[in-house]
């Protein structure tokens, strides 16, 4: 019996009956073995067949078969109802050998030449499988020359059986307070050869409750519990299972916050496991009271571990811990079963005792020291010398504790002094200088430093003065001896004030001209206003209409008299507004330089002199009265003018004020 | 982490005014709390002074109101203490302190030794 | 001003004894009070607060208790640590502070 060719040889090659192509004789037999590579199959096919045709193919014959298995037993030239001749059939080894048979009997009725047949390895495709058989693997199936090779799907590996994909399903850990876990793949059968264990763990003081939920279906036995696929439940005090079979397990209620579950299965079965719903529970927190005038968010019908609730207090009240201010407020409940922090209080908001005011007085509207939420306080300045600043003076206790103005300030309001108030009545008329009675010119200011010098009271802080009269002691503002509230300049009893800081104008040059000369002197207090302290005006825009050429100034102060000394007593003169052109014209001839009086200076006395100011005049406030107003306003300050004060055909100089608002308020604004 | 910082003089004159700076990190003086002053006097008497709270509001002690400010600077997350007029009374170790009644935890500066003396 | 009086000036204890803090307001403080450490060199520490609420940190051997106008702290299982001075404070009108009890090994 020829044996085929056997691999690692070429396996292909030609079979044929003995004689082909001529007849075959009687009572032959032969065999052909032949094997290919493991994980090749053979392939054959006949290219001529013509043996004699008997019942059931018993005379002549040539049989194909593979291991135990006969593939086929052929005969015949044409296939008929129970012969079978191979025609254009393909035949194929089962595994990796063919065994091939021909046989003839002793007689031939005539004579057949038998058959001839090709024969080749090729790969066997061990991933494509007959319908209703098992797949070779559980996932992905690879084939290549020769074999095949099985793969699985994420989150699964290949057992080591090579076909089975077992499910990766240890080591998951649910912490949240309720969740779901169920077998792999659920609804879908659960993967074979697997073991998975899941755990639940929550915090300390949490206890797990199981609930089976949809459907339950692992491979069980009728008589012996769960042999095959489990599912055991496992707590710090008890085990629960193991469970198998179609019936959905009861409620777990576990009493711990720890649950370990694994469910194990075998090799065979087509089932669709399990789902599990979890949810906890906790020792519930006492239900929380809000305090009055508040409540409490979110509510729940019951409140448990880590479960918390805030307070909101109504509008005009506020979270406070005993003194102890809140802007939020937020309680845990902890495992005890205790809150971890008590319950704040939801008090009135109170703004407390209005701050006094300077120079004014404030009235409880709502009831006497009522300063709780939406109380009313009244505030006012005192009378005559005082007035209110753009304010009402009204202040409500708003919800965020702070006096508010209906204007929306928290600020005080301010008590500004009313300015330009004097005792004096004018006459119109020129006079000569006269003393100066209580009240006449009650912004008028003694400046001693080095020399005697005036200046005017702005505001209750600040000073108007000249340049020149205090420029030694810009850098030195505490040397200035500021005097105010008396008429007699050596008198003891007045109101002291002390500079701060000296502002001079940055366009003055000293010992050059007198363009500019206007200083401020801001002081370190406030001072109280009264009929004797009170500040002059600063000019209004429309204040020109009152200072036109010969309308009347008043200068005022303690400088030189008529008798070559300073003035005892306060001293005043009314004096007209000169042109000035006229002015100009009159300080141009020497020993006057050129340019002397610019348009930063107003001239004011009598061409026929003697009503004048002089020296110690210095800083002080050339005034008039702005008769829409009915108050006094600056219009010059005491500057220069010839050296023999009130000399006729010469006028005092002032340093033009209105031309100096801005840098007045600029600065009393920025200091 | 919280923290608080105090900072000023150690050493000021009677009649002058003592001033300190808390300086905040960790956590915003605005968000919530009251932010407080209190000094340990020698003997080691603990005194409240007083406090300024999230909204700027401001508590002081009754005995000490009439020479006493407490104010804050939100860019800066600071607040401090002005205390007008001392006297040799008023030396202590001056802390600052986050105290919030439980809701939340109590934070103290290190303290800042002040001695008042001419 | 509602006073805090910490009567006990001193305390002797020893090691693993248990000791009680007291402290009496002049007045009626609801709850609101809190226990305070401090260490020598050191900023106060607190322990306790609302009476009876431990801060988070605190050892379980503090204990506060009390409400009104009495008020107690206990440490139990004393340790060498616990060596300090401890104060109480009032937060429910303004805030006072008691004058202090200085805990010392007997």
């Known amino acids: 019996t020829p044996l085929g060719p056997k691999w690692p040889e070429p396996v292909f090659g030609r079979l044929a009956s003995p004689g082909f192509p001529g007849e075959y004789a009687n009572d032959q037999e032969r065999r052909w073995t032949l094997t290919a590579p493991p994980g090749y199959r053979l392939r054959l096919y006949f290219t001529h067949f013509d043996l004699e045709l008997s019942h059931l193919c018993e005379y002549d014959f040539v049989k194909l078969s593979s291991g135990a298995k006969v593939l086929a037993t052929l005969c015949g030239q044409e296939s008929t109802d129970t012969e079978r001749a191979p025609g254009k059939d393909t035949f194929y080894s089962l595994g990796s050998s063919l065994d091939i048979t021909f046989r003839s009997d002793y007689s031939n009725e005539k004579p057949f030449t038998g058959f001839e047949a090709f024969y080749a390895a090729e790969d066997i495709d061990e991933c494509q499988v007959a319908p209703g058989e098992a797949p070779t693997c559980d996932h992905h199936c690879h084939n290549h020359l020769g074999g095949f090779y099985c793969s699985c799907r994420a989150g699964y590996v290949l057992h080591r059986n090579k076909r089975t994909c077992s499910a990766l399903c240890s080591g998951q850990v649910f912490t949240q307070r309720s969740g779901e876990l169920s077998s792999p793949e659920y609804p879908r059968p659960y993967p074979k050869l697997s073991s998975c264990t899941y755990s639940i763990s929550l915090e300390e003081g949490f206890s797990v409750i199981l609930d089976f939920v949809e459907s339950f279906d692992v491979e069980t036995h009728p008589e012996t519990l769960c042999p095959y696929d489990f599912l055991k439940i496992q707590t710090d005090r008890e085990e629960h299972g193991p469970f198998c079979g179609k019936t959905l397990p009861h409620r777990i209620e576990t009493k711990s916050n720890t649950v370990t579950i694994t469910f194990v299965t075998d090799e065979s079965g087509d089932h669709t496991g399990w789902k599990i719903h979890y949810t906890s529970t906790a020792q519930p927190c006492p239900y929380p009271m809000a305090p009055p005038n508040g409540h409490v968010s979110p509510v729940q019908a019951k409140y448990i571990l880590k479960d918390s609730f805030s307070i909101f207090c109504e509008t005009g009240y506020e979270l406070l811990q005993g003194h102890l201010p809140l802007k939020s407020f937020t309680a845990v409940c902890q495992k005890d079963g205790s809150w971890d922090r008590p319950m704040p209080a939801c008090s009135i908001v109170d703004c407390g005792p209005p701050d006094d005011l300077p120079s004014g007085r404030v009235e409880y509207i709502t009831g006497p020291g009522v300063t709780t939420y939406k109380a009313v306080i009244q505030y006012s300045c005192e009378e005559t010398f005082y007035t209110m600043k753009v304010n009402d003076g009204k202040y409500v206790c708003e919800a965020d504790g702070f006096w508010t103005s209906s204007k929306g300030e928290k600020s005080l309001p301010v008590c500004e002094p009313v300015c330009g108030l004097s005792a004096r009545t004018t006459g119109g008329r020129i006079y000569g200088g006269q003393k100066a009675k209580p009240g006449d010119f009650p912004w008028q200011v003694l400046i001693l430093g080095g020399t005697t010098a005036a200046g005017a009271l702005l505001y209750d802080n600040w000073v108007l003065t000249a340049a020149h009269a205090v420029y030694e002691q810009k850098h030195d503002a505490s040397a200035l001896d500021i005097r105010m509230g008396t008429l007699k300049r050596l008198s003891p009893h007045y109101t002291q004030a002390w500079s701060e800081a000296v502002f001079i104008h940055e366009g003055y040059t000293h010992d050059a001209g007198f363009d500019n000369d206007i200083a401020l002197i801001k002081l370190n207090n406030k001072v109280v206003i009264n009929s004797n302290i009170t500040p002059i005006c600063l000019p209004r825009k429309e204040a020109e209409s009152f200072m036109r050429t010969d309308d009347i100034g008043t200068a005022s102060g303690w400088g030189l008299t008529q008798r070559g000394f300073l003035a005892r007593n306060l001293m005043y003169v009314d004096i007209p507004i000169v042109d000035h052109q006229k002015c100009t014209a009159a300080y141009e001839k020497p020993p006057y330089p050129r340019g002397s009086v610019t348009a930063n200076m107003l001239c004011a006395g009598l061409e026929s002199g003697g009503k004048d100011s002089c020296r110690g005049d210095s800083g002080g406030a050339l005034v008039f009265l702005d008769s829409e107003t009915e108050r006094w306003f600056v219009g010059g300050i005491v500057s220069w003018g010839s050296m023999n004060c009130g000399e006729a055909g010469q006028y005092g100089v002032y340093t033009k004020v209105i031309n100096y608002i801005p840098w007045i308020e600029n600065i009393i604004s920025d200091f | 982490d919280v923290q608080l910082q105090e900072s000023g003089p150690g050493l000021v004159k009677p009649s002058q005014s003592l001033s300190l700076t808390c300086t905040v990190t960790?956590?915003?003086?605005?968000?919530?709390?009251?932010w407080n002053w209190i000094r340990q006097l020698p003997g080691n008497k603990l005194e409240w002074v007083g406090y300024?709270?999230?909204?700027?509001?401001?508590s002081y002690n009754p005995s000490l109101k009439s020479r006493i400010s407490i104010t804050r600077d939100t860019t800066k997350n600071q607040f401090f203490l002005q205390l007008n007029s001392v006297t040799t009374e008023d030396t202590a170790t001056y802390y600052c302190?986050?105290?919030?009644?439980?809701?939340?935890?109590?934070?103290w500066g290190q303290g800042t030794s002040v001695t008042v003396s001419s | 001003n509602i006073v805090m009086t910490q009567s006990q000036k001193f305390m002797s204890t020893s090691v693993g004894d248990r000791v009680s803090v007291t402290c009496k307001a002049s007045q009626n403080v609801d709850t609101n009070v809190a226990w305070y450490q401090q260490k020598p060199g050191q900023s106060p520490k607190a322990l306790i607060h609302s009476a009876s609420y431990r801060y988070s940190g605190v050892p379980d051997r503090f204990t506060g208790s009390g409400s009104g106008t009495d008020f107690i702290l206990t440490i139990s299982n004393v340790q060498s640590e616990d060596l300090a001075e401890y104060f109480c404070l009032q937060y429910n009108s303004y805030l006072t502070f008691g004058s202090g009890t200085k805990l010392e090994l007997k």
């Open positions: 302190a986050k105290l919030a009644g439980g809701h939340g935890m109590d934070y």
């Open positions: 300024i709270s999230y909204s700027g509001r401001t």
């Open positions: 960790g956590y915003s003086i605005t968000s919530d709390y009251a």
